[in-house]
Structure formats: C-alpha cells, structure tokens
Interface confidence: low
C-alpha cells in the first residue's frame, strides 16, 4: 500500500505564438480544479477507462478575474498536494491523466459550470519511494507543470511497496533469511505470508494471501503442471486434473471482481464494474471515503467523511454511474433540432445550427425573412417556412408594393361613407352613428354610447382612422 | 418565432415610479439573459440591467440605486422599475434577449416603449 | 465602466461602397463585442457577435473583425437599406456598455 502524488507547480500559456484566451473574465470570474486519473502498466486506454490504480480531485483554487488587456497569465492554483492511495502493490509502470476544469462562478443557468480546459496524458516508469520527478505536459496552447512520487505506507517498503517491515525483535540482527529494512535500517523486513498450502517451489505472492504460479504450473496452489499434450475440450473441467495446456479459463471464470462487482472481458484482460464503496482492479478496496476521491470525471463527491457512511458522486451532464466513471452519449438523443450539429462538451450540450437557424437547440427559423425586403414599410414576419409581409396602412400584397384601397373592405358601418385618406381612411357617418368607423349610435338625447365624442366634434362629422 | 412584446406607462410626472413589463411568446425562457436598454431621443443606447430566469440580476450602476428588474417565469414575464424619475429619463426603452455565453448577442428585442417624463 | 469609442461619428457614401467602421475599448475586452444596426423608429438589430460571428440571416456583406481594444465593422458592398446608424456593444464587463454611434448616410 501507498500513496502516488501529485504537485501541480504551474498552468498557463505555453511558450510560441497563440496565447490562449484566459478562461475567465470580468464578467464570469471562475476558478481552477485538477483531477488526476491513474490506471497501471503502460496501456493507451480511453480516458473515459476506469481509474484502476485510483483517482483524487483537487480542492477548487483561488477565484481569478482576468486582468482586462493583459496575456493569460499562469492562473492560481488550489493548494497542496493531490493524492491518489493505491492499496495493492505499486505497478512501477503507469498511465496518467491529469485535466484541468474551469468553474464559473456567476450565475449559472442549467447546473454547474465546470468545463475541462485541458487534459493532458502519459505513461511513465516509477519506482516507490524515489524522488520527486518532474514533468512538462502541453495541452493545445496551454502548459501544466508538475511533479511526482509514489511512497510506500508503512509497513510497506520497496520499489513496489510489496515488502512488509517489522520492528526489529533484537537490535542486532533480522530473522533467519531476512534482512534489514533500507532505508529504515533499524526495522526487518517481515515475512510475505502466501496463501496457505501455495507451492514453495512453483508458486509465489506479492501480497498476503494470494498464490500466482510460476510458467508451467498452475492450480490454485500452483501444484498442478502444465501439459502439452492434446485435449479433448478446449475449455473443459479436466484440464487442471490432467495438466492440459489449454487457452486455460475466461478472464471472467470464477468472477475474479470482489464485493459484488460484475466482471466483462477485454481482448486481454478483465474488466470489474463495481458497486458503489468498492474500486480497484478487482473491487477489492472498501472503505471508500471522498478523501480517496472516487468521482471521476469532474464528479463531486457528497458524504462518506468516514469509511462507515457512503459516498455519493453526483455527476456532472454527460456522465453516469455510481462513480461518474460512464460517459452519456446525450447526442444519441437528437436534441438539436432542423439538422443541427450536435455537440457533447461534457458540461453542457451544445447545437450548432445551420444557417438560418438558432436557438439553444436550433428551434427557431430565422431564414423566412432572410433577403426578402417588404415595401413601403412593411415587416416581414415568418412562419412555416414561408416569409408574408404586415404591411403598412395603404398597401397590400405580398411583399407591400400593391397600394391598397382602404376602403375596399368597406370599414364604415351603419352606411357610413368611405373616403382613402393619405394616413389611411376616414368614415363620414350616417345621422345616429359616429366614431372612427361609424361603430357608435348616437342616443337621442344625443349623449354617445361609447365612447364620449372628443370635444368639438358633432356626431356626423367625418371621424379619421388612425 | 420568439417575440419580445412591451408594455407600461407612457407619460410619467417628475419623482414618479416608471413601471414597464415584458412579455416574451415563443422560445425558451430559461438559459438567457433579459435586459432593459434605454435610447434618450437622438442619443445612444444604454444598458438598464438584466435579469436571468432564476431573479438573479445585474444592474448598471450609474442607475442602481434607482432601479428594480423582477421576473415572474410562470408568465414568461420580466419587468422594470425605475424610480424618482426625471426628464434625463425620457427615452424610448427597450426590453431585449441576451444569449449566454456566445459573445454580444441581443437578438430578439421588443418594440420600444417612449416614456416621457415632463411636469 | 469600460468606454466604448466609435468613429467616425457619421459618413457619407454611395450604394456599391465599402465602408469600415471602428470602435475602440478603453481597455482589452477579449472578442466580446457585437455590432447593432438601428433604424429610425426601430429596435436595434444584431449583426455580428463575438466580434467576428455573423449573426444568422444576415447578408455576408457585414463583416466583423479585430480583438482586445480595436474592432471594426465592414460592409463590402453597401446597399440601399444599409443606411442606418450602427452601434458596437462590449459585454466583456459590467456594465454592458454601447459606444456612441457611427450614422452612415447617402452621399
């Protein structure tokens, strides 16, 4: 058991031309988080793979408000170390993602902000409890400087953590075939206790408990030899009776996954999804808590203080699982609408519409009206992908070049006469009506109805429609 | 096809509260920002405030003291209070859609609302 | 508040033209810039967002360019209902800030 860590020293522009654009601004100030992923062995796998060496999350930096006109400068960074507890033996080979994700801090609309600005990815050899080694990563136009170790928890020691030391019994000297601890000279190394009854001769362990044979045997205590000699079945349950060389069992046979995990085959290996409290190569480490940091992917880890109590990761958009370890494909849902191009950022969704169109998910036709003027002052207004023109008072048609008869709808009622007026048209009203279309009888008494005449104006007298 | 149609009083004495409402029709309301932009008459246009979905707002502050922007989602609606006014407020004000995060972009605006504050 | 310089305050030109407006930030405001284009009587109408992002449905002949404190607006080809007066916006900061207006006229 042991401890990787990580000390990210800087994050900037790289060196050249094409500073980067400072992810925040005076308007959305944000902040720095860093995750790291670590998986063993020297293997490309996809960066949505499970952490199987673990993960750690940084606590969030400094708020940073760009300096208006100034190059993105190095941004602030949180403080301390990020550390990523590996409780089976140190690889001594290893994969590495590390992400840098920006947080805005204004007022967020449709969940938290946080986006990765950089991700950077490599694969190293690193012994146990050496010295810091240094590293350059550049992602597009920016540069993340670090540094790293893997240490050994005591009682481990060695370059993979593998070897136990004890208090020495006597000052002097280590047990029968033991030597002293280097560099703790003052303790001996322990005994590795195998599983009980594995072969002292054709099996071995790295940890307690276990029994790995040796080429050539095989068996749960390595007691059984290989043959190779022809058999019957290529998968049959003979084959660790009679010693046959056989492609042997399905990496998932037996379901080498612990607590409940699921096991499923990869062209080389084994894959365990485990159940939440549970991670590792083979769901073997428990008493997870969200200091271990087992939300991936810019998750967010709630409760678990102690390992008692559960964690829950609450994923950001576009991941799932109990560890946020599944991407979402969100796109598969075909939310961008009138052919937009669809585009999974991880933080958020986003369409890009074709032209003519806009919207968050391309909903709106703006292309009705694109290039077609209405005449005379009329407004072009669009809908079912045909444009129609609402024309000012005295034109008509199509596109508002037609100039209209007002009157021609006969708009004065009650028998009011119709006069085109240049602002429009104009109503001289039948004895007994009166308002701008006649609409309105008189009462005898000569009181109106509805509404009261404007002063000066008798009933009768031409009323103008504005 | 959004629409941004506006509405309030148009004629305001001195010290007077100015009261006007937006409605939006068509499109979503939640994921931007709307504002309030004011043009004295032969003059240039200057930004009010704005307000998102959920209340949050920002205001100009040569006008804060002064002025309230509200939200009342269950209408698509958003409004603007400006108190103690005087004739440096006569302008045609105008409410308007601001996209988040995708650079200056008020796309959609309302008609315009003159409000004229004379004794 | 960041100010907003546009110029020139007016010009005259004839249709077929290429015109170039500028406005200028008192401080480095990244891209985030639009243009607006306002007619009489009407509500302003966006152009360009980002400095350089045509807005959809606008004619290619607007053009949006420049970065951090000097931005221009061209029209490659100035048309007859191009006469209006346009107006740069920065929502780099708060306040939004509008610059002064360039009217460009018939010559």
């Known amino acids: 058991a042991g401890v990787f860590e990580l000390q990210i020293h800087s994050f900037g522009p790289g060196p050249g031309p094409g500073a980067p654009r400072s992810p925040c601004s005076a308007r959305l100030p944000c902040r720095l988080f860093f995750r790291v992923c670590l998986k063993p062995g020297l293997s490309e796998e996809a960066a949505e793979s499970p952490c199987a060496l673990g993960a750690a999350l940084s606590a969030r930096g400094p708020v940073y408000t760009e300096q208006p006109g100034a190059p993105a400068p190095d941004l602030p960074l949180p403080d301390g170390l990020l550390q990523v507890p590996f409780r089976d033996a140190w690889p001594g080979t290893f994969s590495f993602i590390i992400e840098t994700w920006r947080e805005e801090l204004g007022d967020q609309i449709g969940g938290p902000a946080w986006s990765l600005l950089a991700r950077v990815a490599g694969r190293r050899r690193l012994a146990a409890g050496g010295p810091w080694a240094r590293d350059i990563q550049r992602a597009g136009a920016w540069e993340l400087r670090f540094s790293y170790r893997a240490r050994c928890e005591p009682p481990a020691v060695g370059t993979a953590c593998t070897r136990l030391c004890r208090p020495r019994s006597a000052p002097s000297r280590c047990g029968p075939g033991l030597r002293p601890c280097a560099p703790l000279e003052d303790e001996c190394e322990a005994p590795l206790v195998c599983r009980a009854g594995c072969s002292p001769e054709h099996g071995f362990c790295e940890q307690p408990g276990e029994c790995r044979c040796l080429e050539g045997w095989t068996g749960p205590l390595c007691t059984v030899p290989v043959s190779t000699s022809s058999c019957l079945s290529p998968r049959g349950p003979s084959s660790a009776t009679t010693g046959c060389l056989v492609p042997g069992p399905g990496p998932c046979d037996g379901n080498p996954c612990a607590n409940g995990g699921s096991c499923s085959e990869t062209p080389r290996s084994f894959e365990c999804t485990c159940p939440r409290g549970f991670y590792g190569l083979r769901c073997e480490v428990s008493g997870v808590t969200c200091a271990d940091g087992p939300c991936f992917n810019g998750g967010l880890c709630v409760g678990g203080a102690d390992p008692d109590s559960a964690y829950i990761c609450h994923c950001p958009p576009g991941f799932q699982g109990s560890n946020c370890e599944k991407r979402v494909d969100r796109c598969s849902l075909q939310p961008c609408r009138n052919g937009g191009l669809c585009l999974d950022l991880g933080h958020a969704l986003r369409c890009r519409c074709r032209a003519g169109f806009a919207g968050p998910r391309c909903e709106h036709d703006l292309d009705d009206c694109a290039g077609r003027a209405c005449a005379n002052g009329g407004t072009c207004v669009e809908g079912g992908g045909a444009h129609r023109c609402s024309c000012a008072l005295g034109f008509g048609g199509r596109d508002c070049r037609e100039r209209a008869d007002p009157c021609a709808a006969r708009p004065c009622a009650h028998g009011g006469r119709c006069y085109a007026h240049f602002s429009g048209l104009v109503c001289a009203c039948a004895p007994g009506y009166m308002g701008a279309r006649c609409e309105f009888p008189v009462h005898p008494d000569g009181a109106s109805a509805l509404p009261a005449a404007p002063p000066g104006l008798r009933p009768g007298d031409p009323q103008r429609y504005l | 096809q959004v629409q941004l149609q506006q509405w309030g009083a148009g004629l305001l004495k001195p010290s007077e509260t100015l009261s006007l409402t937006c409605a939006v029709y068509g499109g979503s309301f939640s994921g931007y920002y709307w504002s309030w932009i004011r043009q004295p008459p032969g003059k240039g246009l200057e930004w009010i405030g704005e307000?998102?979905?959920?209340?949050?707002?920002n205001y100009n502050p040569s006008l804060k003291s002064r002025v309230s922007i509200s939200v009342d989602t269950s209408k698509n609606q958003f409004s603007l209070k400006l108190s103690s006014v005087t004739a440096a407020d006569t302008a045609v004000y105008y409410c308007?859609?601001?996209?988040?995060?995708?650079?200056?972009?008020?796309?959609?605006w309302g008609q315009g609302t003159l409000v004229t504050v004379s004794s | 508040a960041i100010q907003m310089t546009q110029s020139p305050s007016s010009l005259s030109a004839s249709v077929g033209d290429r015109v170039a407006l500028t406005c200028r930030a008192s401080q480095g405001i990244r891209d985030d810039l639009g243009w607006y284009q306002q007619k009489p009587g009407k509500a302003p109408k966006l152009l360009i967002y980002a400095a350089s992002s045509l807005q959809s449905g606008v004619p290619s002949r607007f053009s949006g360019s420049g970065s951090d404190t000097d931005f221009t607006l061209t029209i490659s080809s100035l048309q007859p209902e191009d006469f209006a007066t346009y107006y740069c916006l920065q929502d780099y900061d708060y306040p939004l800030t509008f610059g002064g207006g360039t009217k460009v006229e018939i010559k």
């Open positions: 308007a859609r601001g996209e988040y995060g995708s650079g200056s972009r008020f796309d959609y």
């Open positions: 307000i998102t979905h959920s209340g949050s707002t």
